[in-house]
């Protein structure tokens, strides 16, 4: 197994590591046959790397001290395995008025303090969205707040003091939306024990449809860390995530459409999944649609992806063009498609790992080719890789942090394209940043749909 001999880790650390990776990163322990130590060691190493990458640790593939410390840190019980900001398939509440009910109260705190902490936690999210929350005392609420210990009626039993503090379910009927807090923790209004308000803000994020963030400053980061509740604020990543689901606090906000009907082009909260140039046109991808913008012309047209490329999926996540080769690369999950002269090439999709990504990379957020350097930049979570298109291999020294090398951009991005020989256009939620890569700074901030004359 991938043990670092210098730290002389005991067997129980390995077992603890296995259990942690099973619970939060999908390591299948029944696929770790003792008779195949090399095979099982590789599986475990991959999962350690995945965890280290997601939680911002040095990626060693070893159960080193900092990794074990992180594994022992108190945390949310929801797995990190998806690497998404929004939960898969994006379950969201299809209404703006959401009810909650506190099913039972922890004896650790006064009832009024529990009520206040939960109310303030909901308020954190209503402040940045059009959502309104109201507490009910009887009947069926959308979100049920429960204090429970051990097994408590779902698939995910609590584990006693420490370890998992709480968990919550994404929007939906029945158990959907419910937030469970481990009664074996000592819940408090302050820095001692476990702060209920801070934990509730995180869990309510899940109740509204958010997954875990790999940004350590985000409230949706998986592990618990006390911060001063009087000065607490959501990170930019949290706000981007929740507003990508519900929009900002403006009245009469359009809800995400359950039937995936055509998004409103001039919706001020419109975000894009991927953007790329194709010759003198710009393609903007969203769900199963794309808009076609011919450079310098105001007119745009919306099309179904399937109408142009019937064999391609909806929900394209990243795209880039190598104009000199008349090639466009389209990415979804761990696969990519090659389009040549606007026609899909046979024998695709292929795995993104053929570019040389490590196995823990499961999807690409955005990609852009720079013809000056003949390099493609791949953005994954809060990091990016640089790929040499001539040598067909990754440049050494990557990944690097987006925020370190693209001043004012990040920690994550939705889409990016290259234009006018010197600009990258980065998309983050409903915002767009014109970035001069020679000056290495943002030169303009725009709305994502500014290209359409909105």
């Amino acid at each position: 197994l991938p043990l670092n001999s210098s730290t002389s880790l005991e067997k129980n650390n390995v077992l603890f590591g296995e259990r942690y990776l099973e619970k939060f990163y999908g390591l299948e322990i029944n696929k770790l046959p003792v008779t195949k130590m090399k095979y099982s060691g590789n599986l475990m190493k991959e999962k350690i790397q995945e965890m280290q990458h997601f939680l911002g640790l040095k990626v060693t593939g070893q159960l080193d001290t900092s990794t074990l410390e992180m594994m022992h840190a108190p945390r949310c019980g929801v797995p990190d395995v998806h690497h998404f900001r929004e939960m898969p398939g994006g379950p969201v509440w299809r209404k703006h008025y959401i009810t909650y009910r506190i099913n039972n109260y922890t004896p650790d705190m006064n009832r009024e303090d529990v009520d206040y902490a939960i109310r303030k936690a909901f308020q954190v999210w209503s402040n940045v969205t059009p959502l309104k929350f109201s507490k009910i005392n009887t009947g069926m609420a959308d979100i049920l707040v429960v204090f429970a210990r051990g097994a408590h009626g779902d698939f995910h039993a609590f584990d006693g003091k420490g370890g998992i503090l709480a968990h919550a379910f994404g929007p939906g009927s029945g158990i959907g939306g419910d937030a469970h807090f481990d009664e074996d923790e000592f819940w408090t209004t302050h820095s001692g024990g476990t702060n209920l308000f801070l934990t509730a803000v995180h869990e309510i994020g899940h109740s509204l449809g958010l997954g875990h963030s790999s940004d350590p400053k985000a409230v949706m980061f998986p592990t618990y860390k006390y911060v001063d509740i009087n000065t607490f604020r959501l990170s930019a990543d949290d706000i981007r995530g929740i507003q990508s689901l519900y929009g900002d606090p403006k009245e009469n906000q359009r809800l995400p459409n359950p039937d995936n009907s055509e998004p409103a082009l001039c919706d001020p909260n419109l975000s894009f999944d991927a953007v790329t140039t194709v010759g003198n046109k710009i393609f903007f991808f969203k769900d199963r649609f794309f808009w076609l913008k011919v450079s310098e012309r105001p007119k745009t047209s919306v099309n179904l992806i399937s109408s142009l490329w019937p064999t391609l999926p909806s929900g394209i996540e990243a795209a880039y063009e190598i104009e000199a080769r008349n090639q466009v690369f389209l990415f979804k999950d761990d696969k990519y498609w090659l389009i040549s002269n606007l026609r899909p090439e046979p024998n695709y999709p292929k795995s993104i790992h053929s570019f040389g990504f490590p196995n823990f990379v499961k999807k690409i957020d955005a990609a852009v080719f720079n013809p000056r350097f003949y390099r493609t930049y791949f953005f994954v979570d809060n990091q990016y890789w640089r790929y040499d298109e001539r040598r067909q291999m990754m440049d050494p020294g990557y990944p690097k942090l987006i925020t370190k090398n693209f001043q004012g951009i990040g920690p994550k991005i939705d889409a990016v394209f290259y234009s006018k020989n010197k600009y990258y256009y980065f998309f983050q939620g409903s915002n767009q940043f014109e970035y001069d890569f020679l000056l290495q700074r943002i030169t303009k901030t725009l709305k994502s749909n500014s290209w359409f004359g909105c």
Epitope: L144, G153, D154, F169, G170
Partner: antibody, heavy 122, light 103 residues
Framework: EVQLLESGGGLVQPGGSLRLSCAAS????????MQWVRQAPGKGLEWVSG????????MYADSVKGRFTISRDNSKNTLYLQMNSLRAEDTAVYYC???????????????WGRGTLVTVSS | DIQMTQSPSSLSASVGDRVTITCRAN??????LNWYQQKPGKAPELLIY???SLQSGVPSRFSGSGSGTDFTLTISSLQPEDFATYYC?????FGQGTKLEIK
Amino acid sequence: EVQLLESGGGLVQPGGSLRLSCAASGFTFSHYWMQWVRQAPGKGLEWVSGIVPSGGLTMYADSVKGRFTISRDNSKNTLYLQMNSLRAEDTAVYYCARDIMGAYASGLFHNWGRGTLVTVSS
Amino acid sequence: DIQMTQSPSSLSASVGDRVTITCRANQSIYTYLNWYQQKPGKAPELLIYAASSLQSGVPSRFSGSGSGTDFTLTISSLQPEDFATYYCQQAGIFGQGTKLEIK
């Protein structure tokens, strides 16, 4: 309309292997948790295994842990159950069922297939 | 571990009768209880979720109640098509079933 159709059942000797499939249609398969539930002849229902929408996380009943492997191919809208080291007590009708969206399973089985019979006997 | 105990295990009743089936958990499961109906040779069908919410398309003669450890499924006026086996369930645990037969 949501449809789930199991296949792959049959007669197998103790210690043998079998792979069940469940073809899904009528919903966005890649958004949902999927589960396997079984029912021995004349007996009650027993939960067997579940898998997260992305396929990266799985759960098993103690009775099958280490012997059965659940997996899915979202591009084919298909759920699988690989059953190894089969025992007589694994004889049952195996149903696949659709759970909820999201990172966590609810155990709320909204839709069920018709089932496929697995008989383990020498 | 949580266990679910269903009673009775079988029950004879007539068309038009009011029937109640109970399910008890050995510790609190809040309102996380579902009820399914299964007819011979068929797959189970969801009737009630979250203890009292009627699944879409299920007739209103079916109702559920309870929270914590004690739950009931009530059929207000039995119809011929209701003779079947009923299971309570939470997460990965099913009750042993109640077979409802014609008297």
